[in-house]
């Protein structure tokens, strides 16, 4: 028989981790494996049909993607949809496929909302998801004794898929569920330096453990301004939520990785500022199969897709699509063996959930909700060399923090700063002697009203639903 896989991904724009130029070669490799293995879908031919999730402008579109999905559904009656990856594109498609009872498999759509499988029935996420980032952060807070307060800052970039909005949403909700902790969150516009200054004044009043989702350049600018404002690593820690490790790549990402380095005359200050910085990324798979897969992936991308793939963590997404497709093939094979059909979406999906699988990305564990357990790495700076290196990994399956290579976290005072200052954020603790604080220090504490409309908090509704804000 014939089994049709309907692809809804960006076909022209190659910048997304789930662009077809990247995922296509991974799909080819997966289907070649299925064909070569007699135990997978014997007697079946798998074919792919392509549709774009992009608008005419070449960016992910919440209009184009569902229209494409509808066209593919009526023209080809696919057994499974592959993609979309972008959140705004995946949301309507996922609702349609749920209504059609057709499985949707993606290694994108990382937003918290897709975890609601009543709304997104039969959606399986073989890639990372942001709620899992919350699991890591919660484990880190528990281990470091930060159980009272955290602050999250995220960049708003007009006209894109709002990755930082969704990163923060997943982290925020999951950390609050896992820990009885106050998490404040502030949105800011990238490039608005005046706003950065206001932002850092609020930071002083709201947090000591701060998570920042932004571009590498913006993070560096914020760190420089923080240093200037006296927000040093002795009292503050700034985690850059840089999941694909962009700050650790490029010219400043070559080994040794120095994300603070730009050769712009500010490197000395940036080096000092980054004593307070740590970077959170996805974990690079370290199994030999992954390296071999990358070699084949790059070759195929160049030969058949006329695309040159760079090194980096973005390649974990095509790899996750590859593993997801093999897992799907396994589930269909088992469903057929038990008397089911390729259109039996519920049965196939249930066989993909709550199971482990050895893929090119290593040990892959799908949770009972159809979302992959995600591993993360925490990078920190060696105070001697200024180079960032992985100090610990988070194993999503075991929920354990796993330390690496004898490295230790770099704390300027020899221990992590408390998440709430000894005397409280506004020196409100009566046990503290008010005389110890200078008038200058008090002047630095800006009231929230001073920020006025600049400060934009995420509402719970925003975090649960996918709409532009």
């Amino acid at each position: 028989g014939n089994l049709t896989v309907a692809v809804v991904l960006p076909l022209a724009n190659t910048s997304y981790p789930w662009s077809w130029a990247r995922v296509g070669p991974a799909v080819e490799l997966a289907l070649a494996k299925v064909k070569a293995r007699p135990d997978l879908l014997p007697g079946w031919t798998v074919r792919t049909v392509l549709g774009s999730s992009e608008s005419a402008l070449g960016v992910c579109s919440d209009t184009a993607a569902p229209l494409t999905a509808v066209d593919l559904k009526w023209e080809h009656n696919p057994a499974v949809f592959l993609g979309p990856g972008c959140v705004y594109a995946a949301a309507p498609v996922g609702r349609f496929t749920a209504h059609w009872r057709v499985p949707l498999l993606t290694a994108g759509a990382p937003a918290l909302g897709f975890g609601a499988k009543d709304e997104y029935a039969l959606t399986t996420r073989a890639g990372p998801s942001h709620a899992k980032l919350g699991d890591f952060v919660a484990a880190l807070h528990r281990r470091l004794g930060w159980e009272r307060q955290a602050l999250v800052l995220y960049a708003y970039q007009p006209g894109d898929d709002q990755p930082c909005f969704f990163v923060v949403g997943g982290l925020y909700m999951r950390v609050r569920d896992r820990l009885n902790i106050t998490v404040d969150h502030l949105e800011f516009a990238e490039g608005d330096r005046d706003h950065y200054t206001l932002l850092l004044r609020t930071v002083r009043r709201k947090g000591r453990v701060i998570y920042i989702c932004s571009s590498p350049d913006t993070f560096r600018t914020l760190m420089l301004l923080a240093l200037e404002a006296g927000l040093s690593g002795e009292d503050y820690v700034f985690f850059h939520l840089d999941l694909f490790g962009h700050s650790l790549q490029g010219a400043h990402g070559l080994v040794p990785r120095r994300p603070w380095e730009r050769e712009d005359g500010q490197d000395v200050s940036a080096h000092q500022a980054f004593q307070a910085a740590k970077i959170i990324t996805y974990k690079e798979p370290d199994n030999p199969e992954y390296l071999e897969f990358l070699r084949k992936l790059k070759h195929l991308a160049r030969e058949q897709f006329n695309f040159t793939m760079e090194d980096g963590l973005v390649n974990t997404i095509p790899a996750a699509f590859h593993d997801g497709l093999l897992l799907y093939a396994q589930a269909v094979t088992e469903t057929l063996a038990h008397g089911g059909t390729v259109t039996d979406g519920e049965s196939i999906t249930q066989r993909m959930w709550n199971r482990s699988f050895q893929g090119v990305t290593g040990y892959l564990k799908m949770d009972s909700n159809g979302d992959r357990e995600t591993d993360f790495s925490l990078w920190d700076m060696d105070p001697e060399t200024g180079a960032f290196r992985v100090v610990l990994n988070f194993n999503g399956t075991s929920q354990e923090l796993v330390t690496v290579s004898g490295h230790t976290l770099n704390w300027p005072l020899g221990h992590p700063p408390p998440d709430v200052p000894r005397c409280g954020f506004d020196n409100e603790d009566p046990a503290c002697n008010q005389d110890h604080f200078s008038t200058l220090e008090e002047q630095k504490l800006i009231s929230e009203e001073d920020l006025g409309g600049e400060q934009k908090l995420i509402s719970e509704e925003d975090l649960h639903h996918h709409h532009h804000h």
Epitope: R143, L401, V402, T403, T408
Partner: antibody
Framework: QVQLVQSGAEVKKPGASVKVSCKAS????????IHWVRQAPGQGLEWMGI????????SYAQNFQGRVTMTRDTSTNTVYMDLSSLRSEDTAMFYC?????????????WGQGTLVTVSS | AIQMTQSPSSLSASVGDRVTITCRAS??????LGWFQQKPGKAPKLLIH???SLQSGVPSRFSGSGSGTDFTLTISSLQPEDFATYYC?????????FGQGTKLEIK
């Protein structure tokens, strides 16, 4: 509660090797490092080396380089310290101790010690 | 390797006395220093980490100070159970190194 339990006392001849074990319990084994410390009778503490249980990474003090090997077994949460080419000066109490690389609290829990006597 | 020089090597004091032990590093080690107490036949016990942070369960009469190269352990009012040997340890980088110890005896 956190515990590091070491193997029993050993008597060895010069030139022989000794393997001392340290079994960890009460915490996540792969989240902390294990260090070994030697103390000769009436002498001070001497750091021997470290092992990272998650990946087996080791770093040894110059004094012990070439003679010491630290290994781990994650299935039993046990770390081993193997010291070869023993001489009488190696007669000492050997301790394992835990180090938290996240909070960077050094050697907060210690084993009870293993006395190794090297004598002909 | 970083050398740790502890002084004095021995010290006699009486119950109730205030006692200070110092440790000097051969190079800057920021705040990465711990203090340990060891009694005969027992394993060492961590008193202070990160130069001045009291380990949980340790009496508040013990305090640590210093940064960079010079560090101090102070016992504000000696108790009978405090007579022991004290060691400093630098955990700034590998190899970790201990001071040679200070034996605190009853006068």
């Amino acid at each position: 509660q956190v515990q590091l339990v070491q193997s029993g006392a050993e008597v060895k001849k010069p030139g022989a090797s000794v393997k001392v074990s340290c079994k960890a319990s009460g915490y996540t084994f792969t989240s902390y490092y294990i260090h070994w410390v030697r103390q000769a009778p009436g002498q001070g503490l001497e750091w021997m080396g470290i092992i990272s249980p998650s990946d087996g990474y080791t770093s040894y003090a110059q004094n012990f380089q070439g003679r010491v090997t630290m290994t781990r077994d994650t299935s039993t949460n046990t770390v081993y310290m193997d010291l070869s080419s023993l001489r009488s000066e190696d007669t000492a109490m050997f301790y394992c101790a835990r180090n938290d690389p996240l909070t960077t609290v050094a050697l907060d829990y210690w084993g009870q010690g293993t006395l190794v006597t090297v004598s002909s | 390797a970083i050398q740790m020089t502890q002084s004095p090597s021995s010290l006699s004091a009486s119950v109730g006395d205030r006692v200070t032990i110092t440790c000097r590093a051969s190079q800057g080690i920021r705040y990465d220093l711990g203090w340990f107490q060891q009694k005969p036949g027992k394993a060492p016990k961590l008193l202070i980490h990160a130069a001045s942070s009291l380990q949980s369960g340790v009496p508040s009469r013990f305090s640590g100070s210093g940064s960079g190269t010079d560090f101090t352990l102070t016992i504000s009012s000696l108790q009978p159970e405090d007579f022991a040997t004290y060691y400093c340890l630098q955990d700034y980088n590998y190899p970790f190194t201990f001071g040679q110890g200070t034996k605190l005896e009853i006068k």
